[in-house]
Interface confidence: low
């Protein structure tokens, strides 16, 4: 297990196809190791773009060429197929198709694979074993779509092989190749600021934590040793350098801010928590 990523680990490819009208469409393809984007697809050159130095895993150039060819062919076929069947499937322009497929690892072992297709953001069909099955809630349109998709058993065999063989081999190689990057420990920086005033006589205190890796982090406003339950944590956001950023806010009456502190725990700190005192901030700021 690469320490930087939470179990279960997954590698998945997402294809988002937007169909604006019969002739105008656009697609975005990306590859993800859990929540870290590792690959993207360059539609102009029909090539896979490796976003990390280790994104090739242990696959050879030849294997990547085969995968590129497969993606190129499948992208074209998918566009053509969806456009051809859009009318009888009652897909109304503009619409979006999102396909996500990949595999999962649990305790270093491959625990399963998945491939799902959504129409307009709702579950539509999924690939199980060696064929496409409709989601029950998706109705007759989805059943008909599966009938179309299952006409080509050869394609389904390739899909099955990608999910059950190629993906598990790839994720293991990717984790090994990226080990140094994924297991790195980068210490957070923290600072305090005022947020927008929540109302008369009240303050919003903001604790910013940035530049940390891996993602798991604990940030809390404290009064002495007492955790302040009013602490609001924002989403952990990615930074351009592959580290993470988080802000934690607390609304308090102006006279109650004095003995508050922000405490940050992170694996890179090895138990030496960062503690920033609001009174120090306000005396400087």
């Amino acid at each position: 297990n690469a320490d930087g990523l939470k179990e279960p680990l997954s590698f998945h490819v997402t294809w988002i196809a937007s169909f604006y009208n019969h002739s105008w469409k656009q697609n975005l393809v990306s590859g993800w190791l859990s929540d870290l984007q590792t690959h993207t697809w360059d539609s102009n050159s029909s090539t896979i773009v490796f976003l990390c130095p280790w994104s090739r895993g242990n696959f050879s150039n030849e294997e990547w060429k085969e995968l590129e060819t497969l993606f190129r062919i499948r992208t074209i076929r998918s566009f053509e197929g969806i456009r051809r069947y859009a009318h009888e499937l009652q897909f109304e322009y503009p619409f979006e198709i999102q396909v996500t497929g990949g595999c999962e690892l649990h305790s270093g072992k491959v625990s399963g694979s998945f491939l799902q297709l959504a129409y307009q953001g709702s579950d539509f069909v999924s690939f199980q074993n060696n064929s496409w099955l409709p989601y029950p809630v998706a109705g007759n349109m989805a059943k008909h779509f599966c009938k179309v998709l299952n006409q080509n058993q050869h394609e389904n065999d390739i899909t099955h092989n990608l999910l059950s063989d190629t993906c598990p081999r790839f994720i293991l190689g990717l984790l090994d190749a990226g080990k140094a990057h994924l297991q790195r420990q980068v210490k957070p920086e923290a600072w305090l600021s005022h947020g927008p005033s929540p109302g008369p006589g009240h303050l919003q205190l903001v604790c910013h934590v940035s530049g940390f890796y891996p993602k798991p982090v604990w940030v809390m406003w404290m009064r002495g040793e007492q955790e302040q339950q009013g602490t609001q944590r924002g989403d952990i956001l990615p930074s351009a350098d592959g580290t993470w950023y988080l802000r934690a806010t607390l609304e308090v009456a102006a006279g109650e801010a004095a003995d508050l502190s922000c405490r940050v725990k992170h694996s890179s700190l090895e138990g030496q928590d960062i503690v920033l005192y609001w009174e120090h901030h306000s005396s400087v700021g």
């Epitope: 280790w54 050879s60 150039n61 030849e62 294997e63 085969e66």
Partner: antibody, heavy 117, light 107 residues
Framework: EVQLVESGGGLVHPGGSLRLSCAGS????????MHWVRQAPGKGLEWVSA???????YYADSVKGRFTISRDNAKNSLYLQMNSLRAEDTAVYYC???????????WGQGTLVTVSS | DIQMTQSPSSLSASVGDRVTITCRAS??????LNWYQQKPGKAPKLLIY???SLQSGVPSRFSGSGSGTDFTLTISSLQPEDFATYYC?????????FGQGTKVEIK
């Protein structure tokens, strides 16, 4: 321990044929692209051919149409069928495993092919 | 095909010396460069992959650097067992191509 053992080299006349074999052990053979790399006496290294895990085959221009690479995953074996051999094909032929990208992380001990009349 | 040019083609050095070998690609190959060591009568051995990553089991006195077209292999303190021929190889595109080799000899 990863091991690659080549066999099948020898002396052959120009225009003749030879089949090289490489037996792999100590790793999951089917999960790796495999290559042949050669080295003429006193010269540098030259990549000859590769076969991917999916069976895709790739050749150097100098051997295209004359050499055929193949693999038998059930036997953990790699092969190179060499036809229409020329004097310039004389070399030690190494089989190599491809790991990170196209880097060759394990090599066999090599087998000498001599093409001479 | 991408041409790889190594320099020098040979060098003489003593045990304990710091040795640097350079490799230049005819076009940008990002970090897709590997270094091998070969001793007479033996198969090549991978030392460095992806320009600067040390292959497991290789002593830390070997290091690689560079990206784009210019790369360097450095042996920080030459040991008796390091006298050999060193090859660079690009893994950016098929066919993979090797430099002509640099022979490191005892002074």
């Amino acid at each position: 321990e990863v091991q690659l053992v080549e066999s099948g080299g020898g002396l052959v006349h120009p225009g003749g044929s030879l089949r090289l074999s490489c037996a792999g052990s100590g790793f999951t053979f089917s999960s790796y692209a495999m290559h042949w790399v050669r080295q003429a006496p006193g010269k540098g290294l030259e990549w000859v051919s590769a076969i991917s895990t999916g069976g895709g085959t790739y050749y150097a221009d100098s051997v295209k149409g004359r050499f055929t690479i193949s693999r038998d995953n059930a036997k953990n074996s790699l092969y190179l069928q060499m036809n229409s051999l020329r004097a310039e094909d004389t070399a030690v032929y190494y089989c190599a495993r491809s790991a990170w990208w196209l880097s060759f992380d394990s090599w066999g001990q090599g087998t000498l092919v001599t093409v001479s009349s | 095909d991408i041409q790889m040019t190594q320099s020098p083609s040979s060098l003489s050095a003593s045990v304990g010396d710091r040795v640097t070998i350079t490799c230049r690609a005819s076009q940008s190959i990002s970090s897709y460069l590997n270094w091998y060591q070969q001793k007479p009568g033996k198969a090549p051995k991978l030392l460095i992959y992806a320009a600067s990553s040390l292959q497991s089991g290789v002593p830390s006195r070997f290091s690689g650097s560079g990206s784009g077209t210019d790369f360097t292999l450095t042996i920080s303190s030459l040991q008796p067992e390091d006298f050999a021929t060193y090859y660079c190889q690009q893994s950016y595109s098929t066919p993979p191509t090797f430099g002509q080799g640099t022979k490191v000899e005892i002074k």
